[in-house]
Interface confidence: low
């Protein structure tokens, strides 16, 4: 239904608090370098304007689109050219090109300082002094570092952030109460950001058909009792929500997500028996809960898939009549029967089925041609099963840190041109698949592991896209969304790589390493490991292990020394010399 004023419509639907929070997120995701105070000023101006439109929808400029209003507001920033360079050229464009231009300048790896957590008392004082500013600052800092963060979900995180401070700043031991909660929010937030980044990449790089296929498979696994028409309706609505959020239309996205949650809860009898608890919660919690809800039980009496999709004489007729509907039904029927498969595997199977029908429906005897199509699925299913089995065995044998190191070596040898920080970040995240998924029984391992790996490899793809250095990464990232993981798995050592020159500075360490947290110390060691492999890509596992063991002993020894800095300087030289000898550098 058309509204005279879109901004008034969204203000009334969302309420002032959510409206302001979402506009702040939108602005911070576009202008990631702007100071907090500047954004707050812009948001207040937009909010005041929205209120005039609520009072009189016919008032001047109230009929303008949100992109026009927000874009005009962003283009008033005085330092746009100095701070953002060519992004300022966006302001010379008209909508919708201007918004597309802003979207293209979103930076997945902005040059922003690491967020340092102040002392608990300092944070509690700031929280009590001005709760609203404190929470806005949280939204701002997360949004500018994660320009594709799912905005309505960020509101949910902010609500939990507020609850943590409200509870813990009154506790006897504030730190014991607060710090674990903040750690949990940080880790969940990073995971949420990465998952949403994959959804946006899927929509933006591979189109809505790819996203819809993913959604059909996932929702069919989650709601196996729902009819195909019901799943289709949810897929259409979910696609709209994510297209809006990925496109920077955060007010529409949040509004439509709320409508979708409302619809799901009003129709839970025909969707899933697992939604009852979610639907009793307030809006933000409800939407989050629905998004994470466990798979419903499969109907007991599902017939064989072969009847409709292989044995029927009408397969080609049905396919020709409406290809995407028929393939959608195939994906729905296969996915609801296989909660034990990853979504990407289900999509590979659907792609194989589609390719077979394209070929066979043009053949002299179509039925004869596609009769064995399900046999082609076997190797596709076994490949991730075997890979997960092998890697879980390795993880159980090594533990997380050493498993990450094994992956660091593996991936550095595959794509040594990629920057060291990216290789460390991605390999550490790949390594977390072990503790995340290997504990699960067989039936849950593949959906956990392979769909998680898709999220992590997408991080590699978006970081690499910003500064492309490897044709192999580009190829694996762009050829097929569902075959990214098999593509990377299949890469061997890059024989064309010219080893990096040895630089002693890279392997010079100082006493400051002793005061780092265990995690940060690991990252330092893993950074050194990547650099070692870049210098000596042909080094064996045994050689690398020996050097890393020596390195760990060196750090431990010097951190216990009275004169730490001297120890690092002198012992460090010896370590570098010994490592060069061991690796033949």
């Amino acid at each position: 239904d058309a509204h005279k004023s879109e901004v008034a419509h969204r203000f009334k639907d969302l309420g002032e608090e959510n409206f302001k929070a979402l506009v702040l997120i939108a602005f911070a995701q576009y202008l990631q370098q702007c100071p907090f105070e500047d954004h707050v000023k812009l948001v207040n101006e937009v909010t005041e304007f929205a209120k005039t439109c609520v009072a009189d929808e016919s008032a001047e400029n109230c009929d303008k689109s949100l992109h026009t209003l927000f874009g005009d507001k962003l283009c008033t920033v005085a330092t746009l050219r100095e701070t953002y360079g060519e992004m300022a050229d966006c302001c010379a464009k008209q909508e919708p090109e201007r918004n597309e231009c802003f979207l293209q300048h979103k930076d997945d790896n902005p040059n922003l300082p690491r967020l340092v957590r102040p002392e608990v008392d300092v944070m509690c004082t700031a929280f009590h002094d001005n709760e609203e500013t404190f929470l806005k600052k949280y939204l701002y800092e997360i949004a500018r570092r994660h320009p594709y963060f799912y905005a309505p979900e960020l509101l949910f995180f902010a609500k939990r952030y507020k609850a943590a401070f409200t509870e813990c700043c009154q506790a006897a031991d504030k730190a014991a109460c607060l710090l674990p909660k903040l750690d949990e929010l940080r880790d969940e937030g990073k995971a949420s950001s990465a998952k949403q980044r994959l959804k946006c990449a899927s929509l933006q790089k591979f189109g809505e058909r790819a996203f819809k296929a993913w959604a059909v498979a996932r929702l069919s696994q989650r709601f196996p009792k729902a009819e195909f028409a019901e799943v289709s309706k949810l897929v259409t609505d979910l696609t709209k929500v994510h297209t809006e959020c990925c496109h920077g239309d955060l007010l529409e996205c949040a509004d439509d997500r709320a409508d979708l949650a409302k619809y799901i809860c009003e129709n839970q009898d025909s969707i899933s028996s697992k939604l009852k608890e979610c639907c009793e919660k307030p809006l933000l919690e409800k939407s989050h809960c629905i998004a994470e809800v466990e798979n419903d039980e499969m109907p007991a009496d599902l017939p064989s898939l072969a009847a409709d999709f292989v044995e029927s004489k009408d397969v080609c007729k049905n396919y020709a009549e409406a290809k995407d509907v028929f393939l959608g039904m195939f994906l729905y029927e296969y996915a609801r029967r296989h909660p034990d498969y990853s979504v990407v595997l289900l999509l590979r199977l659907a792609k194989t089925y589609e390719t077979t029908l394209e070929k066979c429906c043009a053949a002299a005897d179509p039925h004869e041609c596609y009769a064995k199509v399900f046999d082609e699925f076997k190797p596709l299913v076994e490949e991730p099963q075997n890979l997960i089995k092998q890697n879980c065995e390795l993880f159980e044998q090594l533990g997380e840190y050493k498993f990450q190191n094994a992956l660091l070596v593996r991936y550095t040898k595959k794509v040594p041109q990629v920057s060291t920080p990216t290789l460390v970040e991605v390999s550490r995240n790949l390594g977390k698949v072990g503790s995340k998924c290997c504990k699960h029984p067989e039936a849950k391992r593949m959906p956990c592991a392979e769909d998680y790996l898709s999220v992590v490899l997408n991080q590699l793809c978006v970081l690499h896209e910003k500064t492309p250095v490897s044709d192999r990464v580009t190829k694996c990232c762009t050829e097929s969304l569902v075959n990214r993981r098999p593509c990377f798995s299949a890469l061997e050592v890059d024989e064309t790589y010219v080893p990096k020159e040895f630089n002693a500075e890279t392997f010079t360490f100082h006493a400051d390493i002793c005061t780092l947290s265990e995690k940060e110390r690991q990252i330092k060691k893993q950074t050194a490991l990547v650099e070692l492999v870049k210098h000596k890509p042909k080094a064996t596992k045994e050689q690398l292990k020996a050097v890393m063991d020596d390195f760990a002993a060196f750090v431990e020894k010097c951190c216990k020394a009275d004169d730490k800095e001297t120890c690092f300087a002198e012992e460090g030289k010896k370590l570098v010399a010994a490592s060069q000898a061991a690796l033949g550098l």
Partner: nanobody
């Protein structure tokens, strides 16, 4: 409810050109196939041209080489460029969008008249 609105029809001399446009009132997320159809005086409605979401096109034999179907995804608009028009091309031209998850949509039609 999404509406389709055709425009660009009119009266043209034989051998002339017209460009029809079909605009959707809002973004349609589940397009499967887009097409132009026509209904000449006293005739059944017939297919003129189709385009898939992957931009594969197909044409009725009678218009091959003369008509070109295209779409502008960002503007939610379907086009039909008609060159070398003939009197037998006269009729009411409709656009249709077949959808994956919803019933198909038809426009209300735009009249094309080719005089000899």
């Amino acid at each position: 409810e999404v509406q389709l609105v055709e425009s660009g029809g009119g009266l043209v001399q034989e051998g002339g050109s017209l460009r029809l446009a079909c605009a959707a009132s809002e973004r349609i997320w589940d397009i499967n196939l887009l097409g132009w159809y026509r209904q000449g005086p006293g005739n059944e409605r017939e297919l003129v041209a189709t385009i898939t979401v992957g931009d594969s096109t197909s044409y009725a034999d009678s218009v091959k080489g003369r008509f070109t179907i295209s779409r502008d995804y960002d503007k939610n608009t379907l086009y039909l460029q008609m060159n070398s028009l003939r009197p037998e091309d006269t009729g009411l031209y409709y656009c249709k969008i077949r959808r994956t998850w919803h019933s198909e949509l038809w426009g209300q039609g735009t009249q094309v008249t080719v005089s000899s």
